[in-house]
Each structure stands twice: as C-alpha cells, then as structure tokens.
C-alpha cells in the first residue's frame, strides 16, 4: 500500500488498492477511511477517483483547493476539492479555477488587465465584507505564473511573496496585496500575539530579514502592553 506522509506523519492504515500492489494504473487507495458524505455514506469513487487528503492548497492539483468536504464539517479532515468556476462563491483565491480570483466572495476573471483594474477597484470599496480580503492563504501557482512574467518591483500587485523581486515580500495594502521591502535591522515590525491576527491588518508589514527577529525594543520594556514597540533585531 501507499503511505503518504505529511510533515513526516504517515497517514496510516491505507487499504490496499483494488487488485494488488500500490501504483498500478487504475488502482484506487482509500485515503481517509473515516470521512463521510453529508448523507452518511463513505465517498463513492467515480472512475476509481479517490479524494486526496491535504493540509494546504499547494498539495492539491492545479484545478483544486484544500478544504473540509462538508460545510461546517470536521475541520481536522480536509481533502482536495474541485475548484470553483467563474461567478461561483469563494472565500479565497485558491478556491477559484485558474484564470480567476476571489473578489467579494465571488470568483471573477483574472486576465491581466482585468485583474489589475479589479484590484484597484477593491481599494475604494467599503471594508466589511467578510470575503473581500485578499488573505494570506497559499495561492494557485498557475494563477501567479500567468499574471507575472517578471518578478514584481516595490509597489507591484502580487498574490504571494514569490511574485516579488528579491528583498521584497507580498503584504496587504488596503484591500490588495503589493510587494513591500523586507524589514531591515532597527525597523519597526509587527509581533502577532494571537495566531491569525495578521488577517486584521490593512497595512501589513513584511517580515524581518535574514538573521533578524521581531523583538521588543530594549527601551520599551517598561511601557504598557498595548504600546510596546517591536523592531527587527539580530538573533
């Protein structure tokens, strides 16, 4: 049988494929024996297609994203699901099929000129739609490679840091994301006390550069919790 390892943890107890040894064309290996459809049945295979367990979008195929198969289902169980076509509902870019991105909860076309216009539009829109953020989830590789032929310079619209030139990262700016400089020694940085709190930032900073970490500035130790200043300092 095939054993899949995610971050060095084997997904154990995979049943043998139909008809024998792992790897024979047409064979199917059941991935997550405990996952149920909303109706209570185990996954039905279509042409021996077996869902692939995942932890992030990048592990899936180019036309898939990683999510829990049932709305409000067990958050611990995620599989690769078919991407959403244009005008379908979405919560992040990776949910939309290649050539589209998620805007205000709907998959819209991301052809180059159209995409740039859409991004500029989103900056002027009122904040408050749960789905309007261009969040920090992993982005579809084909989307970014389609849109950016050269690495983005400072201020260029981006989807992820790999879209930006060396020394820059992709960070939120209003409701779009642009390439910003990676922070240098002594520059103010953001230390997130709560996991996921970076999602609330409208003006997101880059991370500290190599050999630096974001720590409380020495002379600010006495200050109150809310006003403590963090800067990039040598390890």
């Amino acid at each position: 049988t095939l054993n899949s390892v995610l971050n060095s943890n084997a997904i154990k107890n995979l049943p043998p494929p139909l008809g024998g040894a792992a790897g024979h064309p047409g064979s199917a290996v059941s991935a997550a024996p405990g996952i149920l459809y909303p109706g209570g049945n185990k996954y039905q295979t279509i042409d021996n297609y077996q869902p692939y367990p995942c932890a992030e979008d990048e592990e899936c195929g180019t036309d898939e994203y990683c999510a829990s198969p049932t709305r409000g289902g067990d958050a611990g169980v995620q599989i690769c699901l078919a991407c959403r076509k244009r005008r379908k509902r979405c919560m992040r870019h990776a949910m939309c099929c290649p050539g589209n991105y998620c805007k205000n909860g709907i998959c819209v076309s991301s052809d180059q000129n159209h995409f740039r216009g859409e991004i500029e539009e989103t900056i002027t829109e009122s904040f408050g739609n749960d789905h309007s953020t261009l969040d920090g989830y992993s982005r579809r590789t084909t989307l970014s490679s389609k849109m950016y032929h050269t690495k983005g310079q400072e201020g260029s619209v981006c989807l992820r840091s790999s879209d930006c030139a060396s020394g820059l990262c992709c960070a939120r700016h209003f409701w779009s994301k642009i390439c910003k400089p990676v922070l240098k020694e002594g520059q103010v940085c953001t230390k997130h006390r709560r996991k996921g709190s970076h999602g609330l930032e409208i003006f997101q900073r880059c991370y500290c550069g190599e050999g630096l970490s974001c720590r409380i500035q020495k002379d600010h130790h006495q200050a109150s919790n809310s006003s403590r200043l963090h800067t990039c300092q040598r390890h």
């Epitope: 077996q50 869902p51 692939y52 898939e64």
Partner: nanobody, 129 residues
Framework: EVQLMESGGGLVQAGGSLTLSCTAS????????MGWFRQAPGKEREFVAA????????HYADSVLGRFTISRDNAKNTVLLQMSSLKPEDTAVYYC??????????????????????WGQGTQVTVSS
C-alpha cells in the same frame, strides 16, 4: 533537452546504507512530483517513494516506510533517496522520474508510473547478504 540523471548506486551489505541522487537538467521541476521506482530482474517496475511539488508531502511504499527517506532541493534541481537498513530484496535498478502537477489529484497519483513524464536511465543497487 530534459534529462534526469541518477547516481549513488552500488554494492552494499545487508543492513547498510546508500544515498541515491537524481539531478534534473533542461528545465525546472518545482511544479513536478519527483519519484523513485525500482525494477528487480524478472519483476515489474514498482513504486518506492515520491515527493510532491509541495515539499511537505512525501509518499512511500509499505516495503520501504521507515527505512527510506526522500527529499528534494529545488534550487539545485536534485532529489535524494536515503536508504538505510537495506535488505537483499531491495536489490534492483532504481529509476528517478518526474510527474507534472495534475489538474485533479487522487491518492494513487504518486504511485502510478504512467503519470510520470520523464525518466532517468537508472542506477543499480545491489544488497548482498
């Protein structure tokens, strides 16, 4: 021209270790899964291990789980297969292969040889008892 070149094979005693290396040239393989297959004389080619385009994900055949470790370095376009606690039954020609990231993925994708577009020439591993 795309080429996969294996190296590191050889003769080793049972219980010993070897590290196979596969170097890709002619294109970048960062959006490909890289896998190792092996073929013993008179037997079918079988899946050994694979590592996806997403570096966190590795896959192993039952027979090598816990003994073999696959890793990759996209910057150097190389894939390594570290083999320890080798057994005589590991004797085979080991092939490196590359499979493109598909539109849809299933559990058997990585272990299915027909999904791999590029193959190396192979390197012989012989484990003596």
């Amino acid at each position: 021209e795309v080429q996969l070149m294996e190296s590191g094979g050889g003769l080793v005693q049972a219980g010993g270790s070897l590290t196979l290396s596969c170097t890709a040239s002619g294109r970048t393989f960062d959006n490909y899964a890289m896998g190792w297959f092996r073929q013993a004389p008179g037997k079918e080619r079988e899946f050994v291990a694979a590592i996806s385009w997403s570096l966190s994900r590795t896959h192993y055949a039952d027979s090598v789980l816990g003994r073999f470790t696959i890793s990759r370095d996209n910057a150097k376009n190389t894939v390594l297969l570290q083999m320890s606690s080798l057994k005589p039954e590991d004797t085979a020609v080991y092939y490196c292969a590359a499979a493109p990231r598909p539109k849809r993925i299933s559990v058997s994708y990585f272990s299915t040889s027909s999904n791999y577009d590029y193959w190396g020439q192979g390197t012989q591993v012989t484990v003596s008892s």
